[in-house]
């Protein structure tokens, strides 16, 4: 395991897989597209989603303090957003080809996930909200969402890991 | 079963209007993006353009764009192709498609209509 | 708009032969956007392959993809009898383009 006994994780490969992330959650749904969906309604499905904010430890000095605050939110993070890629909004009409990079995300949000789950302890997950689109086609304006705050949870996540790697690593 | 059909072949003057259908069937035809493709007589195929009927979001090809228009009705699962004015060079196959999600956004057209032949002479 | 060449423009082998088919474009392809479809005479068009190397549903193993960047190649290990067709390549990244296809044959 990476935390064991609650210690500081393997940053390095903490570091090289959050990197694997943010390439894949890029490639699941990239900037530039030949189309993207319009955005209708106001309506925000995505509020309940994890954010990795100021007071959670994971600026430098919070690092060095205690990482365990900052790797707890991150890790919560990971696992919510674990569920709701193997959830029915992902694996529904319209299905995803198989190899689709959404499916090599959803199996690495779980491996980093593992790594930072300490041995004999198991951090608090936050419950994934009820989103049920009533329309089928509705699941891909989610689906972009979901993605889109991802990505922005992802690049929170590797920015933290390689500042682990290079400062905190044994 | 996945299937698209479309409707049958039409023969037609210039200057002529003309909608051509593709009926989806055995899926979620409102969620996946049905896109239209252009074979000349003894030619390659060419990206038309393509529709998500659950909301009608539409995008073409430049070299179509404003030369056909691209519709659907949902509640039938029916994607249409028309021209207010056919020309003689508009003779071709045309097949309409539903494109697979690689990603959220695009992917590979995995199931095809059989194809609508249009045939425009004077 | 991304122009893909295909190459050679017919192919003139005989069944149990192996066929390589290039697909070369204009400027650089994600391999994740790459597919290639077979067409039969009078029949529509047929997926083989997309994201540069996975096989399609159904599709026997025989045919393989691979390449990246510009550069993609389709391989039939050992041509069947039903495997004489036209081959096109297809980018569907950004505005869809199509190869003009390449003709396989019997020799």
């Known amino acids: 395991r990476a935390v064991p006994g609650g210690s500081s994780p393997a940053w390095t490969q903490c570091q090289q897989l959050s990197q694997k992330l943010c390439t894949l959650a890029w490639s699941a749904h990239p900037l530039v597209g030949h189309m993207d969906l319009r955005e209708e309604g106001d309506e925000e499905t995505t509020n309940d989603v994890p954010h990795i904010q100021c007071g959670d430890g994971c600026d430098p000095q919070g690092l060095r303090d205690n990482s365990q605050f900052c790797l707890q939110r991150i890790h919560q993070g990971l696992i919510f957003y674990e569920k709701l890629l193997g959830s029915d909004i992902f694996t529904g009409e319209p299905s995803l080809l198989p190899d689709s990079p959404v499916g090599q995300l959803h199996a690495s949000l779980l491996g980093l996930s593992q790594l930072l789950q300490p041995e004999g302890h198991h951090w608090e997950t936050q419950q994934i909200p009820s989103l049920s689109p009533s329309q089928p086609w509705q699941r891909l304006l989610l689906r972009f969402k979901i993605l889109r705050s991802l990505q922005a949870f992802v690049a929170v996540a590797a920015r933290v890991f390689a500042h682990g790697a290079a400062t905190l690593s044994p | 079963e996945e299937q698209l059909v479309q409707s049958g072949a039409e023969v037609k003057k210039p200057g002529e209007s003309l909608k051509i259908s593709c009926k989806g069937s055995?899926?979620?035809?409102?969620?996946?993006?049905i896109g239209w493709v252009r074979q000349l007589p003894g030619k390659g195929l060419e990206w038309m353009g393509i529709?998500?009927?659950?909301?009608?979001?539409?995008r073409y090809s430049p070299s179509f764009q404003g030369q056909v228009t691209i519709s659907a009705d949902k509640s039938i699962s029916t994607a249409y192709l028309q021209w207010s004015s056919l020309e003689a060079s508009d003779t071709a196959m045309y097949y309409c498609?539903?494109?697979?999600?690689?990603?959220?956004?695009?992917?590979?057209?995995?199931?095809w209509g059989q194809g609508t032949l249009v045939t425009v002479s004077s | 708009e991304i122009v893909l060449t295909q190459s050679p423009g017919t192919l003139s082998l005989s069944p149990g032969e192996r066929a390589t088919l290039s697909c070369r474009a204009s400027q650089s392809v994600s391999s994740s956007y790459l597919a290639w479809y077979q067409q039969k005479p009078g029949q529509a068009p047929r997926l083989l392959i997309y994201?540069?190397?996975s096989r399609a549903t159904g599709i026997p193993d025989r045919f393989s993809g691979s390449g990246s960047g510009t550069d993609f190649t389709l391989t039939i290990s050992r041509l069947e009898p039903e495997d004489f067709a036209v081959y096109y390549c297809?980018?569907?990244?950004?505005?869809?383009?199509f190869g003009g296809g390449t003709k396989v044959e019997i020799k």
């Open positions: 529709i998500l009927p659950g909301n009608s979001d539409t």
């Open positions: 297809q980018q569907y990244g950004s505005s869809p383009t």
């Open positions: 994201g540069a190397s």
């Open positions: 498609a539903r494109q697979a999600y690689y990603d959220l956004l695009t992917g590979p057209f995995d199931y």
């Open positions: 055995g899926f979620s035809f409102d969620s996946y993006w």
